[in-house]
């Protein structure tokens, strides 16, 4: 797991998984208009 100051800060903010990898933003959509429907 990542224990650098940056990783600790990000983990507290909920941006990192326990393994230290970035967590995906759980499908908060970006660029919606580039996708058809």
């Amino acid at each position: 797991a990542c224990n650098t100051a940056t990783c600790v800060t990000h983990r507290l903010a909920g941006l990192l998984s326990r393994s230290g990898g970035m967590v995906k933003s759980n499908f908060v959509p970006t660029n919606v208009g580039s996708k058809a429907f």
């Epitope: 759980n26 499908f27 908060v28 959509p29 919606v32 208009g33 580039s34 996708k35 058809a36 429907f37």
Partner: antibody, heavy 115, light 108 residues
């Protein structure tokens, strides 16, 4: 298999409100936005807006602000659209459509506004 | 808002004929924001082409799309009876998203 099942036809009086539903199945409901589209009889398509079920964020066509309200219920994987202060101009088929390039649309809900 | 003007409004074609429908935007848009839909009578629309030139899943290869800026087109390489429908372009570049007024394709 992805499916969007919309609620049945509605016949309502002018001035009333109506809330129609779009039940999603076959995919993770919070993984795509849900669009709503209006089609008057014999006419073209008009985008109303979309809702992001993950965080209930919405974007509206300015024309439909104050007319349409989009909501969703994650527990039942259902998107809703409420239309208020109905007039004959609101008589149309309303479609929900899953955002993405895979082309999933509901079958449409027919709304008739008549006294 | 971005206005999409389709041409022609209606057309009739013979089986086997090549068809081209155009979509002109009132402002320049990136091709990733331009999509095409097909709507058969009594049915919901379905996406044919997304991002100007990408064929949607299950769509026959006789359909193709191209264009950039303010000028886009949908082509049917060889018209078939099952292609009778109304075709719409749609832009997702700016809100409100808008559709073209539609091109009704009939068979001779």
């Amino acid at each position: 298999e992805v499916q969007l099942q919309q609620s049945g036809p509605e016949l309502v009086k002018p001035g009333a409100s109506v809330k129609m539903s779009c039940k999603a199945s076959g995919y993770t409901f919070t993984s795509s936005v849900m669009h709503w589209v209006k089609q008057k009889p014999g006419q073209g398509l008009e985008w109303i807006g979309y809702i992001n079920p993950y965080n209930d964020g919405t974007k509206y066509n300015e024309k439909f602000k104050g007319k349409a309200t989009l909501t969703s219920d994650k527990s039942s994987s259902t998107a809703y659209m409420e239309l208020s202060s109905l007039t004959s101009e609101d008589s149309a088929v309303y479609y929900c459509a899953k955002g993405g390039n895979d082309g999933y649309w509901g079958q449409g809900t027919t709304l008739t506004v008549s006294s | 808002e971005i206005v999409l003007t389709q041409s022609p409004t209606t057309m009739a074609a013979s089986p086997g004929e090549k068809i081209t429908i155009t979509c002109s935007a009132s402002s320049s848009i990136s091709s990733i924001y331009l999509h095409w839909y097909q709507q058969k009578p009594g049915f919901s629309p379905k996406v044919l082409i997304y991002r100007a030139s990408n064929l949607a899943s299950g769509v026959p290869a006789r359909f193709s799309g191209s264009g950039s800026g303010t000028s886009y087109s949908l082509t049917i390489g060889t018209m078939e009876a099952e292609d009778v429908a109304t075709y719409y372009c749609q832009q997702g570049s700016t809100i409100p998203f808008t559709f073209g007024s539609g091109t009704k394709l009939e068979i001779k």
